[in-house]
């Protein structure tokens, strides 16, 4: 056959549909690959052809559009299953062509099974709700185009195995599920089952999404630097290892980029010659507030290093903050000679020095202050 622009297998579109439910799948050519839509193509005399390769087979075969009750049909740029079967799983190709033009793309379709509590291998979209923020809604997703507006479907909402009824703060309202005041206990998977009639048959659409309750913008604050702080002095002798943690708390903010970085004498560590390493760890609270810790480490600190300025910086959509660490060189204890009595004795003057120990565990960081005499 003549050459065809083959866009290959579009694995970005991992389409998953439930067994024994209707599915409408648009040809991806018009959505992602071509600059024109189906109507334009059709007007220009182009024909859309569908075929498929079964799971674990190499043979491309035409789609059978003559199945009982038109189980599989094509309408404009949409391939319809009414309903799907488990063995419909495979790679589907839509090809747009006429005598002079040809373009095609394949995409994987996976028909998945669900249990009575709607558990399945389906990848679930996540919807974030703000904690204690007032009424918020989620909407039953991806049900447009399955039935005309004249058809009034019945919608039942579930949380796991259980129909949502008589819940304290969650109210089903048709295609919407309203959360009067979202709490941590509202975290979980919510399923809407849309039931509608078509040509004397009843079809069900099942859609599950994950609700995650996150920190409210009402409570959001600029980054808070817990360490370094004014209470801790990093006092070291040359040759010792210098470890300075920068621990920053970030309120949850939708789509905010949280950043933590160190500067040494006003420069980024990459831009200076000293041998410094930075290790970062991140932990999250139940409402997705974030604690980032960056530990600045100099294995063998020099007296020059101990004179430098070490500043921790943090930035989020709420603002930018910075805090300098108190670093100083440990003064060696002078030795005094005491004469008299039965001979000589050494007396060390007592200086109080602070050593910092860094302990990581369970997302909590502790400073231990030891006084060495």
């Amino acid at each position: 056959s003549e050459r065809c622009d083959d866009w290959g297998l579009d694995t970005m579109r991992q389409i998953q549909v439930f067994e024994d439910e209707p599915a409408r799948i648009k040809c991806p050519l018009f959505e992602h690959f071509l600059k024109f839509n189906y109507s334009t193509a059709h007007s220009a005399g182009l024909t859309l052809i569908w075929y498929w390769t079964r799971q674990d087979r190499d043979l491309e075969e035409p789609i059978n559009f003559r199945l009982p009750e038109n189980r599989i049909s094509k309408e404009k740029d949409v391939l319809w299953f009414r309903p799907t079967l488990l063995n419909d799983t495979g790679n589907y190709t839509c090809m747009l062509r006429n005598t002079t033009y040809c373009s095609k793309v394949a995409f994987p379709l996976e028909v998945v099974q669900k249990d009575s509590c709607f558990n399945s291998p389906m990848k679930l979209p996540v919807h974030k709700l703000y904690i204690e923020y007032g009424i918020q809604r989620i909407t039953c997703p991806n049900v447009d185009g399955y039935f005309p507006s004249s058809v009034k479907p019945t919608i039942t909402w579930y949380m796991g195995c259980y129909k949502i009824q008589n819940f304290n703060n969650v109210i089903p309202e048709g295609m919407n599920l309203s959360f009067l005041i979202a709490l941590i206990s509202n975290n979980g998977n919510y399923t809407c089952v849309v039931t509608y009639p078509e040509n004397g048959r009843t079809f069900h659409l099942t859609r599950t999404l994950t609700v995650k309750v996150v920190g409210s913008p009402k409570n959001a604050v600029p980054p808070v630097i817990h360490s370094p702080n004014d209470h801790v002095v990093y006092e070291k002798e040359p040759g010792e290892e210098l470890l300075i943690p920068c621990t920053v708390y970030f309120s949850f903010l939708m789509d905010s980029r949280n950043e933590v970085w160190w500067t040494i004498d006003g420069k980024k560590p990459d831009d200076i010659t000293i041998d410094v390493t930075i290790n970062e760890s991140i932990s999250h609270s139940r409402t997705e507030d974030e604690t980032r810790t960056q530990i600045l480490s100099i294995k063998k600190v020099t007296s020059e290093d101990l004179k430098r300025s070490y500043v921790c910086h943090a930035r989020s959509a709420k603002g930018e903050v910075a805090k300098a660490a108190k670093v100083k060189q440990k003064v060696p204890a002078p030795r005094y000679t005491v004469e008299g009595g039965g001979g000589t004795g050494g007396l060390n003057d007592i200086f109080e020095a602070q050593k910092i120990e860094w302990h990581e565990g369970g997302g909590h960081h502790h400073h231990h202050h030891h006084h060495h005499h």
Epitope: D115, S116, C117, N119, M159, G160, C161, Y162, K163, I164, Q165, N166, F167, N168, N169, V170, S185, N186, G188, N189
Partner: antibody, heavy 122, light 107 residues
Framework: QVQLVQSGAEVKKPGSSVKVSCKAS????????IQWVRQAPGQGLEWMGY????????DYAQKFQGRVTITADESTSTAYMELSSLRSEDTAVYYC???????????????WGQGTLVTVSS | EIVMTQSPATLSVSPGERATLSCRAS??????LAWYQQKPGQAPRLLIY???TRATGIPARFSGSGSGTEFTLTISSLQSEDFAVYYC?????????FGQGTKVEIK
């Protein structure tokens, strides 16, 4: 280790009400449902209803609608089943049962209480 | 509601023998079926869910099979502690319903 401990046996007069408690220990942080099931002497198991203590959701079997009330006190991890207008045929052992989460299909009756015998007699 | 029918009502088996219990649903329940064991004076205990998955701590001599409307619980070699009443339960449709039970007794 999750356990369910139920209140003691009760003897009730016809027409009165009974309230059976079910205290959960070692409860997980995730929401879960408490089921109530009864078993008349020498008979099979009959599902009565459930409650989700942390969310308030509940439902009852059609047969018991209007006579049963299932409640929960989250602060004490205790669920209650109250059955009113008692008659002799309500004489049964009443069980509470639960799963670990709301999501595990087939494991919603994973853990059972020891049962509470309610005798209805004049 | 879905009616679950168990057969036989009583099964007399000698220790060491195989026991086969049946459960039929009045309409398809897919694989959404559980089996419970109940000994006198005790609460029921979950044995099998998803028609064939053994619950935690259940010995391998217990196995479940079937889907749709016909289900079977098999105890490959009966031990003395297995003599009890066995219930099937569907959780495909609300209300969740139990069978009337099969008593497995010593022959």
């Amino acid at each position: 280790q999750v356990q369910l401990v139920q209140s003691g046996a009760e003897v009730k007069k016809p027409g009165s009400s009974v309230k059976v408690s079910c205290k959960a220990s070692g409860s997980p942080a995730e929401p879960y449902a408490i089921q109530w099931v009864r078993q008349a002497p020498g008979q099979g198991l009959e599902w009565m209803g459930y409650i989700i203590p942390s969310l308030g959701g509940y439902d009852y079997a059609q047969k018991f609608q209007g006579r049963v009330t299932i409640t929960a006190d989250e602060s004490t991890s205790t669920a209650y089943m109250e059955l009113s207008s008692l008659r002799s045929e309500d004489t049964a052992v009443y069980y509470c049962a639960r799963g670990q989460t709301l999501y595990e299909s087939g494991r919603q009756f994973d853990i059972w209480g020891q049962g509470t015998l309610v005798t209805v007699s004049s | 509601e879905i009616v679950m029918t168990q057969s036989p009502a009583t099964l007399s088996v000698s220790p060491g023998e195989r026991a086969t219990l049946s459960c039929r649903a009045s309409q398809s329940v897919s694989s959404n079926l559980a089996w419970y064991q109940q000994k006198p004076g005790q609460a029921p205990r979950l044995l099998i869910y998803g028609a064939s998955t053994r619950a935690t701590g259940i010995p391998a001599r217990f196995s479940g099979s079937g889907s749709g409307t016909e289900f079977t619980l098999t105890i490959s070699s009966l031990q003395s502690e297995d003599f009890a009443v066995y219930y099937c339960q569907q959780y495909n449709n609300w209300p969740w319903t139990f069978g009337q039970g099969t008593k497995v007794e010593i022959k």
